[in-house]
């Protein structure tokens, strides 16, 4: 039969989409407006840089680490930009509606779309657990949703515990991680006979993965300190991240060949395994003191992603039909946990060493932080799994996950498969 | 040495508009946060605004938001305050003050290092 | 909402002096100490708490956590008399309303 979509979702998906812009467009319309205040052109440069690396890592760097799966790698790249394009616009308006709206109109800044493009990063990463098993239509519902989530959490966390734009942002990585793992486990999950080679990755798309995780490397110190207020802060964020990164790839390359009985190196544990040291440091890199520090959390941290990536993805396959390839979410998760904890650990130790007696109110503030952050991650996750489900999203059927030919145009092929 | 100068005060009637410059000299502004603190005669000091190193956030006072805007030139290495609608609950000495940062439990402690002498603003009818 | 007290005292030469600080909520050591003459601009004493700026005398300390902090002057110097300002960097920047240290 003739790959292309159904025809309800040929209706269904460019209204829904087109509509949405056109609400976007009215609400932008309405109630934004620039940022008129003077501002030098030197310090405009300099703040566009970091937005621009970030938004080099979301398209580049994430759309391109998805894009393994040997029949499935257009989709991965290009719904990727999609939901990207589409996460940045309403994460502006949601983070604009969320704290500045009582005073009239948002006003849009550089920091504004750093943010959203920061947002937007979330969904990406969460997207890993279900590519391949959902349609553009579906994954519309999943951005919005995911989005709204993500802008919630930070601000209850930043009005209840007070936290600042990085440490309220940080808890992405967590937070990305269970919301996408949560949405995964109400998909379908097994795979129909005939379809598994479908789920393999090949040595192309997977160079292009490799290609990504590169440009993830190169800038991740650039997303761990985006957020933060002063040089110094910005400049111990960017050391220990690239020290962490560094030793999570020699780690990561190191340790995939130990877990081979042949001691050969596995292109997936290596994909993901090279961002582990970045992950892991997000939450304290402006606070570790010292290179050694951040160097070993990268060697623990590239330590447990190739571990994870050996012995975790039998169990994700089975329970939330996860495919082998499609490691970033359990990575996330158990990364994301290890930053929290690495965290905790130096607020106990500064505490300890500063003879302060707040130290049972501080470490309570930070895992009320990380568990509201889990439970609203896995709520909104299973809220985003069951509307997935819907009829009305014309989901692709078992038969045709990760395919490439039932979304896109290819002259070459007269059929499909 | 580093110093701050602040300039463009004086009256100004009520409603009206002010631009206050502060002129940094012995650092340069692209690397330092900066904020703009206020006094009225005969009370305490009222933080009105603050412009990160990178001038990429802004953040201002409840009782001046949407009124005064803090913005900055690196290549005059000068800090502004442009105030409108001014009432007389306005009037104060206005300082500039360099935002300095030092690592603290869990999170970073900011405080006010450098301070400039202060230029007076009046608003009356 | 950030309470200094007193608000003013009267001492005299070689007096110790304690100046207090409450916050409404922890701000965990995120406080800091101004030193205010009449017609002057304010000049910083000690950040982060207890860490005192450089070039400010010793006699000068300052202590606490949470919602609790105190700055004490050991043996009053006549150049101290002036008002002094608690300052919180925990979330947006406030101030205290000042302490007048007063010669009795």
């Known amino acids: 039969m003739s790959s292309k979509y159904p025809r309800s979702v040929r209706r269904c998906l460019p209204l829904w989409a087109l509509t949405l812009e056109a609400a976007l467009i009215l609400l932008f319309y309405f109630f934004t407006h620039y940022d008129a205040s003077l501002e030098d052109q030197k310090g405009l440069v300099a703040s566009y840089q970091v937005g621009q690396d970030l938004t080099v890592m979301a398209a580049i760097g994430l759309g391109f680490l998805t894009s393994s799966f040997r029949r499935h790698s257009w989709s991965s790249v290009a719904f990727n930009l999609f939901m990207l394009a589409l996460g940045v616009q309403w994460a502006i308006l949601l983070d604009g509606f969320l704290s500045q709206f009582p005073s009239g109109k948002v006003v849009i800044t550089l920091f504004s779309i750093r943010l959203a493009t920061m947002s937007a990063l979330s969904v990406l990463i969460s997207v890993d657990a279900v590519l391949g098993k959902v349609n553009l239509a579906q994954l519309v519902v999943m951005v919005l949703v995911e989005v709204t989530a993500l802008g919630n959490l930070r601000m209850v966390i930043s009005n209840i515990f007070n936290t600042d734009y990085h440490m309220n942002m940080m808890h992405i990585y967590v937070f990305a991680a269970y919301f996408g793992l949560s949405v995964a486990w109400c998909l379908p999950k097994p795979l129909p006979e005939g379809t598994e080679d479908k789920d393999q990755t090949a040595t192309i798309p997977s160079l292009s993965a490799m290609l990504g995780a590169l440009f993830l490397w190169m800038f991740w110190p650039s997303f761990n300190s985006a957020l933060l207020r002063s040089p110094i802060e910005r400049k111990n964020a960017v050391f220990n991240t690239y020290y962490a990164v560094a030793v999570s790839v020699v780690t990561a390359i190191s340790g995939s060949s130990l877990a081979h009985p042949q001691g050969k190196i596995s292109k997936t544990y290596v994909h993901s395994a090279v961002l582990a040291g970045g992950v892991a440091v997000g939450t304290s890199c402006h606070l570790i003191p010292s290179p050694w520090l951040a160097m070993v959390l990268g060697l623990v941290a590239g330590l447990i992603s190739v571990g994870g990536a050996k012995y975790l993805p039998g169990c994700c396959n089975r329970v939330l039909g996860i495919p082998h390839s499609s490691i970033m979410g359990y990575n996330f998760s158990l990364l994301g946990l290890l930053g929290e904890i690495i965290y905790i650990v130096l607020l106990v130790l500064d505490t300890v060493g500063a003879g302060n007696g707040m130290i049972g109110f501080q470490v309570l503030l930070s895992i009320g932080e990380l568990s509201l952050a889990i439970v609203i991650a896995l709520m909104s996750g299973l809220l985003t799994g069951l509307l997935l489900n819907l009829k009305i999203w014309k989901a692709p059927h078992e038969a045709k996950y990760f395919d490439d030919q039932v979304f896109w145009k290819f002259p070459h092929l007269a059929v499909g498969f | 040495q580093v110093k701050l100068l602040e300039s463009g005060g004086g009256v100004v009637q009520p409603g009206g508009s002010l631009r206050l410059s502060c002129e940094a000299s012995?650092?340069?502004?692209?690397?330092?946060?900066m904020h703009w603190v206020r006094q009225a005669p005969g009370k305490g000091l009222e933080w009105v605004a603050l412009?990160?190193?990178?001038?990429?956030?802004?953040s201002y006072a409840e009782s001046v938001k949407g009124r005064f805007t803090i913005s900055r030139d690196t290549s005059k290495n000068t800090l502004y305050l442009q105030m409108r609608s001014l009432s007389a609950d306005d009037t104060a000495v206005y300082y500039c003050a360099r935002d300095k940062a030092v690592r603290g439990i869990s999170r970073y402690n900011y405080y006010m290092d450098v301070w400039g002498k202060g230029t007076t603003v009046t608003v009356s009818s | 909402v950030m309470t200094q007290s007193p608000s003013s005292l009267s001492a005299s030469v070689g007096d110790r002096v304690t100046i207090t600080c409450r916050t409404s909520?922890?701000?965990?050591?995120?406080l800091n100490w101004y030193q205010q003459k009449p017609g002057k601009a304010p000049k910083l004493l000690i950040y982060a708490t207890s860490s005192l700026q450089s070039g400010v005398p010793s006699r000068f300390s300052g202590s606490g956590s949470g919602t609790d902090f105190t700055l004490t002057i050991n043996s009053l110097q006549p150049e101290d008399f002036a008002t002094y300002y608690c300052q919180q960097s925990y979330t947006t920047p406030s101030f205290g309303q000042g302490t007048k240290v007063e010669i009795k």
């Open positions: 909520q922890t701000i965990s050591r995120n």
């Open positions: 012995g650092f340069t502004l692209r690397s330092s946060g």
């Open positions: 412009i990160w190193f990178d001038g990429s956030i802004r």
